[in-house]
């Protein structure tokens, strides 16, 4: 028994003096606690206890479930224990069937022995089946078998404590281990929409999946920048042990333009934290915007192809579109998508594809769409060039030379005189009169200018040449001249 | 033997106090969640929540989140719920129960329960 | 919060009857179910927990299985002693949420 110098407090003595005792099932057990200041006795096993306030605890007819430790304090609170063991053939074993484990930590079987002389005190699978193999235990008589590190594969792991007792195993009761999962990683976070557009008063309601290995994972909805609590709606599934979902639905049933702003979906455990955000933009009325992606004043050569290209944003759907010309609708050779197939996407494509294109179809092509809330359109001008083409050249009743040439850009009209028979013209003649006429055609179409000489001037045999060029190319039309005496006379002009 | 036994019937007015009590016997005190169970005349069973007299951690479901507050006091193994200032509405049973072995409160489930108190709360 | 959706709200039954109450959890809970029954004027018992295991001392006519989000209790062979209210409760995450109960009443 503890000894202590005199006057300080000692703790009580207990009789007998030892720190174990084994007593038969059925037998007395008698338990003396000596102390001036005695308070109570205490009985504990499995978390369960007793209390006695007499300091003599008797038990005459000693059971299993008697098993356990019995300490005695004092008024100083000083105590002194013994720990009794009832020995009883039929039940070696007292147990309480509730194991849980958490992951990593050191869990209790708690399957106490009721006779410290059997041997062999371990656990073993049920059914026969062996036990993992990096599985380590350490057994304790007073307490149970306890489970070192336990690891996620353990979970749902039946088992017994076993003793041997006359060279036969003997099995308790079985445990069935649960195990919590540790958390070894931040949770995983995901938002149904990055962004979301709404027009006021429409329902804006977004879902966050969280993925953990247990549902114990915090999560919930915030504004930035906001302390307001939003509404929000849970649904969670196991997919087998440690694979948990939860969804964390967020609505605003009626959105309004003031409730545009970035919303953080944010899930915590004990390893860390993670988040994702979405946006949302409420406006008070759709929109459309339109950006031509080529310019929208456009020159193309005759016979070429072009094609007429847009972008625009059109919140909500775009319902119509169309590409007109010259009042009429385009029903083909043009096409209509989404910039992306993403489901929040509000940018789309149209192209008008215009084939070898005429000079008679320049002028001004329209893109025009809507939908529900607004219409749009923007115009294209399209110039077609044209190399010129000489539409007359005459010798008019009063002597003049007349050319006359069409086409696109607006052409040029030089005058050339080549004596004799010279295949080169080169020496240029100035016009008398050069006019830009108005085309009956439509806008956009060719132009058209007369250009006259003096034939007077000419006195010599030889050819004139007219010459009618612009950016796209050139058209020559010669007159042939013969003098017979004094008379001149206009051969018949050609190309 | 293992036992919560729960203070007696309280019969209060409307915006007063109270506090009721639980006391744990035959198993240790601190190793185990005590929660509170409302049972409100003829209805179901509402859990309001938790706590963990070894370190005082406490769990409420969100519909008593601020309207009650659990305690402990784990040298005289008692836990308690209390009102600051009652409703008409809080009259009902209240039930401690001990949360069996389990991980932070969670799975297991109460194996031992109090015999209840009632509350009622009239002008 | 999860919801627990007990069926059916009462039933009326013999004795010796098998009788099946059935809760239906609004999401995965795993096996972290229990059930209890409550005598009028009384707590409420323990009578399963982890959706299967018996607690000590409960006679083995009473019965629980499931897992997920759909859990039975069974009672084999009814007994007079039996004619109680019955909940589930699920302990997977707060808050620990209770079914609205099933009445067995004798027939």
């Known amino acids: 028994q503890p000894s202590v110098s005199p006057g300080e407090p000692s703790p009580p003595s207990i009789h007998p003096g030892k720190s174990d005792l084994i007593v038969r099932v059925g037998d007395e057990i008698r338990l003396l606690c000596t102390d001036p200041g005695f308070v109570k006795w205490t009985f504990e096993i499995l978390d369960e206890t007793n209390e006695n306030k007499q300091n003599e605890w008797i038990t005459e007819k000693a059971e299993a479930t008697n098993t356990g430790k019995y300490t005695c304090t004092n008024k100083h609170g000083l105590s002194n224990s013994i720990y009794v063991f009832v020995r009883d053939p039929a039940k070696l074993f007292l147990v309480d069937r509730s194991l849980y484990g958490k992951e990593d930590n050191d869990t209790l079987v708690r399957c106490p022995l009721t006779d410290p002389e059997v041997t062999n005190y371990s656990l073993k699978g049920c059914q026969g089946k062996p036990l993992p193999k990096d599985l380590r235990f350490i057994p304790d008589p007073k307490a149970g078998i306890m489970i070192k590190s336990v690891k996620r594969a353990y979970h749902r792991l039946c088992l017994h404590c076993s003793v041997d007792q006359e060279g036969k195993s003997v099995l308790s009761e079985k445990f069935i281990l649960k195990v919590r999962p540790a958390f070894k990683a931040v949770p995983v976070v995901s938002v149904s929409k990055a962004s979301y557009l709404l027009r006021e008063g429409e329902e804006f309601t977004v879902t966050c999946t969280i993925k953990d290995v247990s549902s114990s994972v915090y999560s919930t909805w915030k504004r930035e920048n906001s302390q307001t609590k939003l509404q929000e709606k849970y649904n969670g599934w196991h997919h087998g042990d440690f694979n948990y979902e939860r969804q964390a639905t967020l609505t605003i049933s009626s959105a309004r333009v003031n409730d545009s702003g970035v919303f953080m979906c944010y899930a915590n455990n004990t390893f860390g934290s993670a988040n994702v955000t979405t946006t949302l933009e409420v406006v008070d009325k759709g929109f459309i915007n339109i950006f031509p992606m080529i310019n929208t004043t456009v020159f193309v050569n005759d016979g070429e192809n072009v094609d007429l290209i847009v972008e625009y944003e059109a919140f909500p759907k775009p319902e119509h579109q169309q590409w007109i010309y010259m009042n009429r609708t385009f029903t083909d050779k043009w096409e209509d998508y989404p910039k992306s197939e993403n489901e929040s996407n509000i940018r789309y494509v149209s192209e008008l594809h215009l084939t070898r294109l005429k000079g008679t179809e320049g002028g001004t092509y329209t893109f025009l769409v809507s939908n529900s809330d607004v219409n749009a359109a923007i115009a294209f001008n399209v110039y077609v060039n044209t190399k010129p083409e000489i539409l007359t050249y005459d010798r008019l009743v009063n002597g003049m030379l007349q050319c006359v040439a069409a086409g696109f850009p607006e052409p040029t009209i030089d005058w050339y005189f080549c004596p004799g028979t010279e295949q080169r013209c080169s020496a240029s003649v100035l016009p008398v009169d050069v006019q830009t006429l108005n085309s009956s055609g439509p806008p956009f179409g060719k132009l058209v200018v007369q250009s006259s000489i003096d034939s007077s001037a000419f006195k010599h045999n030889g050819t004139v040449e007219c010459k009618a060029y612009n950016d796209v190319g050139k058209t020559s039309a010669y007159f042939n001249f013969a003098f017979k005496g004094n008379n001149k006379e206009q051969i018949h002009p050609h190309t | 033997q293992v036992q919560l036994v729960q203070s007696g019937a309280a019969v209060k007015k409307p915006g007063e106090s109270l506090k009721i009590s639980c006391k744990g016997s035959g198993y240790r005190f601190t190793s185990y969640w005590i929660g509170w169970v409302r049972q409100m005349p003829g209805k179901g069973l509402e859990w309001m929540g938790i706590i963990y007299p070894g370190d005082s951690d406490t769990k409420y479901s969100p519909s008593f989140q601020g309207q009650v507050t659990i305690s402990a006091g784990k040298s005289i193994s008692t836990a308690y719920l209390q009102w600051s200032s009652l409703k008409a509405s809080d009259t009902a049973m209240y039930y401690c129960?001990?949360?069996?072995?389990?991980?932070?409160?969670?799975?297991?489930?109460?194996?031992?329960w109090g015999q209840g108190t009632m509350v009622t709360v009239s002008s | 919060a999860i919801q627990l959706t007990q069926s059916p709200s009462s039933l009326s039954a013999s004795v010796g009857d098998r009788v099946t109450i059935t809760c239906r959890a609004s999401?995965?809970?795993?096996?972290?179910l229990a059930w209890y029954q409550q005598k009028p004027g009384k707590a409420p018992k323990l009578l399963i927990y982890?959706?299967?295991s018996l607690e000590s001392g409960v006679p083995s006519r009473f019965s629980g299985s499931g897992s997920g989000t759909d859990f039975t209790l069974t009672i084999s062979s009814l007994q007079p002693e039996d004619f109680a209210t019955y909940y589930c409760q699920q302990t997977n995450s707060y808050p620990l949420t209770f079914g609205g109960g099933t009445k067995v009443e004798i027939k």
């Open positions: 129960a001990r949360h069996g072995r389990g991980y932070d409160g969670y799975e297991g489930a109460f194996d031992i």
């Open positions: 999401q995965g809970i795993s096996s972290a």
């Open positions: 982890d959706a299967s």
